[in-house]
Interface confidence: low
């Protein structure tokens, strides 16, 4: 179980690196973030570390409610702060593992 979670964490972070470059990856991560109401791997600040992602920008799928340009110059109160690895991991543990 720990190995699976560790693998998922590594894979999620790797996909984040590909987000700006790969439309298919972007669509998958957007769906995960929107469905699980999460943002980034550990938390939303992970997006700052991605090359070619602006420090003040997250994918729109991180927003609690999609508002005008919510992913650009975002307000911290308007986005999901919880990380996806923990949130999706909890769901996997409960339903799959």
């Amino acid at each position: 179980r720990d190995k699976v979670m560790s693998e998922f964490n590594n894979n999620f972070r790797q996909q984040m690196e590909n987000y700006p470059k790969n439309n298919h990856t972007a669509s998958i991560l957007d769906r995960m973030q929107a469905d699980f109401k999460c943002c980034g791997a550990a938390n939303y600040t992970d997006w700052e570390k991605i090359p070619s992602m602006s420090k003040n920008r997250v994918p729109d799928s991180c927003c609690i409610n999609v508002t005008v340009g919510c992913g650009i110059n975002f307000n911290e109160k308007a986005i999901h702060k919880e990380g996806c690895v923990e949130k999706i991991g909890g769901w996997l543990r409960k339903n799959v593992l």
């Epitope: 700006p20 298919h24 669509s27 070619s52 602006s54 920008r57 729109d60 005008v68 340009g69």
Partner: antibody, heavy 117, light 108 residues
Framework: QVQLQESGPKVVKPSETLSLTCTVS????????WNWIRQSPGKGLEWIGY??????DYNPSLRSRVTISEDTSKNQFSLRISSVTAADTAVYYC????????????WGQGTMVAVSS | EIVLTQSPGTLSLSPGERATLSCRAS???????LAWYQQKPGQAPRLLIY???SRATGIPDRCSGSGSGTDFTLTISRLEPEDFAVYYC?????????FGQGTKVEIK
């Protein structure tokens, strides 16, 4: 390399609806912000609005008359401006707002639309 | 909305000279969201600078951007024949995204 191409009628009658389509080739429209920008003769540039995976934002000066939508199956996005007047005569550009620059880094060549009876 | 005012309206210079274009915002703009574009007659604008100071792909290092807050500058250190065009600044940090009215750089 992403390429954008605008298409649609070159002349629209006053009070009718202006409809343009932007076809994206060399990339998918399922990412990025896809924008419409216009430039009236002898004037500067005016941002009309964007769509991104179904989310939209419009310039308040045009919001009541504008609709921007996307068709992912055709890799196209469209602009509709209702109740046009001579003031809507302009060159209309579609443009991509990319992740790398977060600015309008790819533009179509533009299409001139005249509002005239 | 944020109003961007560019000056001068027209800049008459000779090839080899330095061009300094100014863009002033009506309220503070996050420098991450300030861009400069070049437009030639009959063509679409081309992105030169984004994030106030980062050059877009393929833009020569004679073009540079600087500034923060409400005052931004585009500098072309040595004008080449292909640099004579209209230049626009644009902010995309606050909706509606807006452009300046443009500065024309013409051959003296």
């Amino acid at each position: 390399q992403v390429q954008l191409q605008e298409s649609g009628p070159k002349v629209v009658k006053p009070s009718e609806t202006l409809s343009l389509t932007c076809t994206v080739s060399g990339g998918s429209i399922s990412s990025y912000y896809w924008n419409w920008i216009r430039q009236s003769p002898g004037k500067g540039l005016e941002w009309i609005g964007y769509t991104k995976r179904g989310y939209t934002d419009y310039n308040p000066s045009l919001r009541s008359r504008v609709t921007i939508s996307e068709d992912t199956s055709k890799n196209q996005f469209s602009l509709r401006i209702s109740s046009v007047t001579a003031a809507d005569t302009a060159v209309y550009y579609c443009a991509q707002m990319g992740w790398g620059s977060h600015a309008f880094d790819m533009w179509g060549q533009g299409t001139m639309v005249a509002v005239s009876s | 909305e944020i109003v961007l005012t560019q000056s001068p309206g027209t800049l008459s210079l000779s090839p080899g000279e330095r061009a300094t274009l100014s863009c002033r915002a009506s309220q503070s703009v996050n420098s991450r969201y300030l861009a400069w574009y070049q437009q030639k007659p009959g063509q679409a604008p081309r992105l030169l600078i984004y994030g106030a100071s980062s050059r877009a792909t393929g833009i020569p290092d004679r073009c540079s951007g600087s500034g923060s807050g409400t005052d931004f500058t585009l500098t072309i250190s040595r004008l080449e024949p292909e640099d004579f065009a209209v230049y626009y600044c644009q902010q995309y940090g606050s909706s509606p995204w807006t452009f300046g009215q443009g500065t024309k750089v013409e051959i003296k």
